[in-house]
Amino acid sequence: QEEDLPRPSISAEPGTVIPLGSHVTFVCRGPVGVQTFRLERDSRSTYNDTEDVSQASPSESEARFRIDSVREGNAGLYRCIYYKPPKWSEQSDYLELLVKESSGGPDSPDTEPGSSAGPTQRPSDNSHNEHAPASQGLKAEHLY
């Protein structure tokens, strides 16, 4: 019997409000045995894959996606999915990345702590299931 794949989670370090030119790392988490994590931008039109997966906890694995120098164009909605043979998971909730002008003044607000949710629930979409990463049919326009 094929197991039910839990939905992944997504968070951002150091937070979801990032000054222009600073770095941000998206962290995707899923169960043990994930082969590929994918970070999707907006509505699956662009994505990045990684097989560089690490052991996050006894029950979880994770992957990290870093943007070295955030631009205004990086603002938007991000979510994770993963491939655990033989199928893809559902998507995580969306996480919204906000890019702010770097004022540099003493009153600059702190970046928000990383969030593993996001106010927006994504619609159910199981179209990834049963497809290996290479046969996804999506255009791998890189996110950064």
Epitope: T25, V32, G33, V34, Q35, N48, D49, T50, E51, D52, V53, S54, Q55, P58, S59, S61, A63, R64, F65, R66
Partner: antibody
Framework: EVQLVESGGGLVQPGGSLKLSCAAS????????MYWVRQAPGKGLEWVAR??????????YYAASVKGRFTISRDDSKNTLYLQMNSLKTEDTAVYYC??????????WGQGTLVTVSS | DIQMTQSPSSLSASVGDRVTITCKAS??????LAWYQQKPGKAPRLLIS???SLETGVPSRFSGSGSGTDYTFTISSLQPEDIATYYC?????????FGGGTRLEIK
């Protein structure tokens, strides 16, 4: 088809240096963690080093037996993995395998290159 | 470091036999265990990851089980082409460590 081709092995004197290379093809090199694993003649397998991808800041990890002497590196533009080996000892004699890893297990292996440390 | 104790170090069996190899970790590795097959003069081949997950193209006579510190690798019906050395490996924490290997021979 995944291909990993090691080169650079050979005979070297104790205390000497050698640099191994691994040319990778058939997969997206820059999104994968990569490893070196070695096997002394007639012995078992020993993990040597790991390098993560750019998204994980190219973090490196080493076995205690080689730490401070060996350096793992990668050139994503050339799809090539390296192992710089300094202060070589006779116990470093082994076949060195370049490996494409998953989350710490070793999914695809090269054919290996023999390093012999002897005077 | 996590020590992996693999047994037996060698075994002899007949074609069609059920063969079992065990691997014991010195601490819990949370099913981060792989099994490899190595034939003489060749590179190892990954058979199983995450303790039980069979790699694509690996015959179904191979299987893995276990959790915590104790793991088992089984060949349900030994075939002549299965003659090789088998290794377990933990990847819960670095340094990643291998068992000492089990050399499998045909009786």
């Amino acid at each position: 088809e995944v291909q990993l081709v090691e080169s650079g092995g050979g005979l070297v004197q104790p205390g000497g240096s050698l640099k191994l290379s691994c040319a990778a093809s058939g997969f997206t090199f820059n999104t994968n963690a990569m490893y070196w694993v070695r096997q002394a003649p007639g012995k078992g397998l020993e993990w040597v080093a790991r390098i993560r991808s750019k998204s994980s800041n190219y973090a490196t990890y080493y076995a205690a037996s080689v730490k401070g002497r060996f350096t793992i590196s990668r050139d994503d533009s050339k799809n090539t993995l390296y192992l710089q080996m300094n202060s070589l000892k006779t116990e470093d004699t082994a076949v060195y395998y370049c490996v494409r890893g998953g989350s710490g297990f070793f999914a695809y292996w090269g054919q290996g290159t023999l390093v012999t440390v002897s005077s | 470091d996590i020590q992996m104790t693999q047994s037996p170090s060698s075994l002899s069996a007949s074609v069609g036999d059920r063969v079992t190899i065990t691997c014991k970790a010195s601490e819990d590795i949370y099913i981060r265990l792989a099994w490899y097959q190595q034939k003489p003069g060749k590179a190892p081949r990954l058979l199983i990851s995450t303790a039980t997950s069979l790699e694509t193209g690996v015959p179904s006579r191979f299987s893995g089980s276990g959790s915590g510190t104790d793991y088992t690798f089984t060949i349900s019906s030994l075939q002549p082409e299965d003659i090789a050395t088998y290794y377990c490996q933990q990847y819960w924490s670095t340094p990643y460590t291998f068992g000492g290997g089990t050399r499998l021979e045909i009786k």
